[in-house]
């Protein structure tokens, strides 16, 4: 149902990653205005973004309240200019999402090196533990707050004069490894989410070397 | 649902190469890394090395580097091993495996790899 | 590299008896330690990851317990189908290596 002059959005899609959550759709409008509303699957629906005229829609705030529930969005799309217009069914015309899960969905954001310090033998490599959204008695949790020992990185390393690579794995956001003595390491990070079926992996940190200001080097 | 399905088996001459390949379904690989496992006559279980098909890195066991190349083709969702240099003790069933960062949690059912003059 | 030291090599045992085999790492692992169970002219089958969580369809009666570098693997009831080979794997750094293996057979 709908008025004659309205199209129902379509292509409703989730773009998330580390909790930042926007609903995007389709059309562009052309004389009609959208708004959005969510709920989770057992709850009230919560109207956001007022009869606008974008195609996306930020729904963090909403999503961040519980990042372990099922939610629900949809779109409603009004005449321009005629916002209490309903169709023949008494309501305006909407769309709804698929469900989206925030915990088992978002992206897993590109990762960053923070530091690396080398003594002696041993590389300690430290990936940053990214702020999210997410908050708990009005602070922001990092991604490692939110997911726990759900989240591993894995660590790809080189001699920066050769090809062969090594990997480790960790449950924290430091890595301890061997390296050999008088060679210059290149790294790179990648964050995993194990237990998921989807939106596993993150991307590649950018690759960190050794010999560059980011690290720091100590004889021992 | 998980499968691995792993090329037939080889009879190869020593000093000469083989290339063995396992086709993936029922996931995505760039989403896991994946592994090849060596496994002689009556003995243990070998890793030979495992490639991450989202960025392209390998990585090798230091006793194969060099003879060994593992590479993975996300269109065909098929991750390929080849040895070079064959010698007699390369005769083993080889596995491959998916890791999902937490185990090998499924494998194929080996390819046999007979090397012998 | 990490050496993996599994024990004991072979064990004889009954059904009904409870079996354990442990693994013990040269360096810590964090966890990163997962079982296989291995039949004759078959692929491994994957039993325990992340050092103590049963993957699916297996069996109750395995259970995996340890951390740092000392893992166990515990066969509470043991069973027909369970006379097989077991093999740890430590994949917390490269090259990723396995235990020696245990052979259960039946007393």
């Known amino acids: 149902s709908g008025t004659t002059n309205t199209v129902a959005a379509y292509n409703l899609t989730w773009k998330s990653t580390n909790f930042k959550t926007i609903l995007e759709w389709e059309p562009k409008p052309v004389n009609q205005v959208y708004t959005v509303q969510i709920s989770t699957k057992s709850g009230d629906w919560k109207s956001k973004c007022f009869y606008t005229t974008d195609t996306e829609c930020d729904l963090t705030d909403e999503i961040v309240k519980d990042v372990k529930q099922t939610y629900l969005a949809r779109v409603f799309s009004y005449p321009a200019g005629n916002v209490e217009s309903t169709g023949s069914a008494g309501e305006p015309l909407y769309e709804n999402s698929p469900e989206f899960t925030p915990y088992l969905e978002t992206n897993l954001g590109q990762p960053t090196i923070q530091s690396f310090e080398q003594v002696g033998t041993k590389v300690n490599v430290t990936v940053e533990d990214e702020r999210t959204l997410v908050r708990r008695n009005n602070t922001f949790l990092s991604l490692r707050d939110v997911f726990g020992k759900d989240l591993i990185y894995t660590l790809y390393y080189w001699k920066s004069s050769s090809s062969g690579k090594k990997t480790a794995k960790t449950n924290t956001n430091e890595f301890l490894i061997d390296v050999d003595k008088g060679e210059n390491y290149c790294f790179s990070v990648q964050a995993v989410i194990p237990s998921r079926t989807v939106n596993r992996k993150s991307t590649d940190s950018p690759v960190e070397c050794m010999g560059q200001e980011k690290g720091e080097f100590r004889e021992i | 649902q998980v499968q691995l399905l792993e090329s037939g088996a080889v009879l190869a001459r020593p000093g000469t190469s083989v290339k063995i390949s396992c086709k993936a379904s029922?996931?995505?690989?760039?989403?896991?890394?994946m592994h090849w496992v060596k496994q002689r006559p009556g003995q243990g279980l070998e890793w030979i090395g495992g490639n991450d098909p989202a960025n392209g890195h390998s990585m090798y066991d230091p006793k194969f580097q060099g003879r060994v190349t593992i590479t993975a083709d996300t269109s065909t969702s098929t991750v390929f091993m080849e040895l070079s240099s064959l010698r007699s003790e390369d005769t083993a069933v080889y596995y491959c495996?998916?890791?999902?960062?937490?185990?090998?949690?499924?494998w194929g059912q080996g390819t046999l790899v007979t090397v012998s003059s | 590299d990490i050496q993996m030291t599994q024990s004991p090599s072979s064990l004889s045992a009954s059904v009904g008896d409870r079996v354990t085999i442990t693994c013990k790492a040269s360096?810590?692992?964090?966890?990163?330690l997962s079982w296989y169970q291995q039949k004759p002219e078959k692929a491994p089958k994957s039993l325990i990851y992340?050092?103590?969580s049963l993957a699916d369809g297996v069996p109750s009666r395995f259970s995996g317990s340890g951390s740092g570098t000392d893992y166990t693997l515990t066969i509470s009831s043991l069973q027909p189908e369970d006379f097989a080979t077991y093999y740890c794997?430590?994949?917390?750094?490269?090259?990723?290596?396995f235990g020696g293996g245990t052979k259960v057979e039946i007393k």
């Open positions: 992340y050092a103590t």
């Open positions: 794997l430590q994949h917390g750094e490269s090259p990723y290596t």
């Open positions: 360096q810590d692992i964090k966890s990163f």
């Open positions: 495996a998916r890791d999902s960062g937490y185990a090998m949690d499924y």
């Open positions: 029922g996931f995505n690989i760039k989403d896991y890394y």
